[in-house]
Amino acid sequence: QPDSVSIAITCCFNVINRKIPIQRLESYTRITNIQCPKEAVIFKTKRGKEVCADPKERWVRDSMKHLDQIFQNLKP
């Protein structure tokens, strides 16, 4: 399960403080649940690890956009 994330409701309490290279990322999930203390992103890496990140950071937003474009381009 994601680093620093609760099981019952997926929340991020701590976020990674370093950039993950885009080529290591597979997908992401937005966390906006009201029961979570903050909005966050959970990135899933190609090795299957899940990591919380702060969407206010530029690299996080750029990575999300990159993944959006890849996902859309993979569609038939």
């Epitope: 937005r30 203390p37 206010k56 956009k65 959006d68 859309q72």
Partner: antibody
Framework: QVQLVQSGAEVKKPGSSVKVSCKAS????????MHWVRQAPGQGLEWMGR????????KFDPKFQGRVTITADTSTSTAYMELSSLRSEDTAVYYC??????????WGQGTTVTVSS | DIQMTQSPSSLSASVGDRVTITCKAT??????LAWYQQKPGKAPKLLIS???SLETGVPSRFSGSGSGTDYTLTISSLQPEDFATYYC?????????FGGGTKVEIK
């Protein structure tokens, strides 16, 4: 739970300014972005701009650039939107909303601003 | 700026009807689309984000679909409380823009 409570209705003269407040509870505003959206009578929704309360960084629709100021006070969990050089077309309901991703999951109740001579 | 064109601007329907509202962007928005419901005198309520993700507490009769520039909101069986105005909004790039709205009225 999250609540965004806005200041009361305002009646303003053309050429003047208005400042609307939005007090948040149930969340730390420095963790999110606070946006302002307006809606003229019988019209659709129009995004004006947003602030990152953690550092004061703002982004605006170019249509409002130079006429709108968005500020935030993290000590009181309050965001503010000031619109200057008011004209009759600025008569609208002004909403604050939160959302770091660019969509808005919690909204204030709205503040009616009427611009009339 | 990305323009959002919503259609129809209004529609009349009966309770139990299936209702479809469409939204077209002037460029690819990569599923960064939200749908809102607004009732008179009230703030908008977020229904769907990311084109398809239903918000917590939103009834399952609401669904979103689409990709690229074309997106759809469907209400599978219209209920009395669903009569309202619906807006789409792109959040791919600022300035964030809304569609013109679709007013769903009682037939």
């Amino acid at each position: 739970q999250v609540q965004l409570v806005q200041s009361g209705a305002e009646v303003k003269k053309p050429g003047s300014s208005v400042k609307v407040s939005c007090k948040a509870s149930g969340l730390t505003i420095s963790d999110t972005y606070m946006h302002w959206v307006r809606q003229a009578p019988g019209q659709g929704l129009e995004w004006m701009g947003r602030i990152d309360p953690a550092n004061g960084n703002t982004k605006f629709d170019p249509k409002f650039q130079g006429r709108v100021t968005i500020t935030a006070d993290t000590s009181t969990s309050t965001a503010y939107m000031e619109l200057s050089s008011l004209r009759s077309e600025d008569t609208a309901v002004y909403y604050c909303a939160r959302g770091v991703f660019g969509f808005f999951d919690y909204w204030g109740q709205g503040t009616t601003v009427t611009v009339s001579s | 700026d990305i323009q959002m064109t919503q259609s129809p601007s209004s529609l009349s329907a009966s309770v139990g009807d299936r209702v479809t509202i469409t939204c077209k962007a002037t460029e690819d928005i990569y599923n960064r689309l939200a749908w809102y419901q607004q009732k008179p005198g009230k703030a908008p309520k977020l229904l769907i984000s990311g084109a398809t993700s239903l918000e917590t507490g939103v009834p399952s009769r609401f669904s979103g679909s689409g990709s690229g520039t074309d997106y759809t909101l469907t209400i599978s069986s219209l209920q009395p409380e669903d009569f309202a105005t619906y807006y789409c909004q792109q959040f791919w790039s600022a300035p964030y823009t809304f569609g013109g709205g679709t007013k769903v009225e009682i037939k």
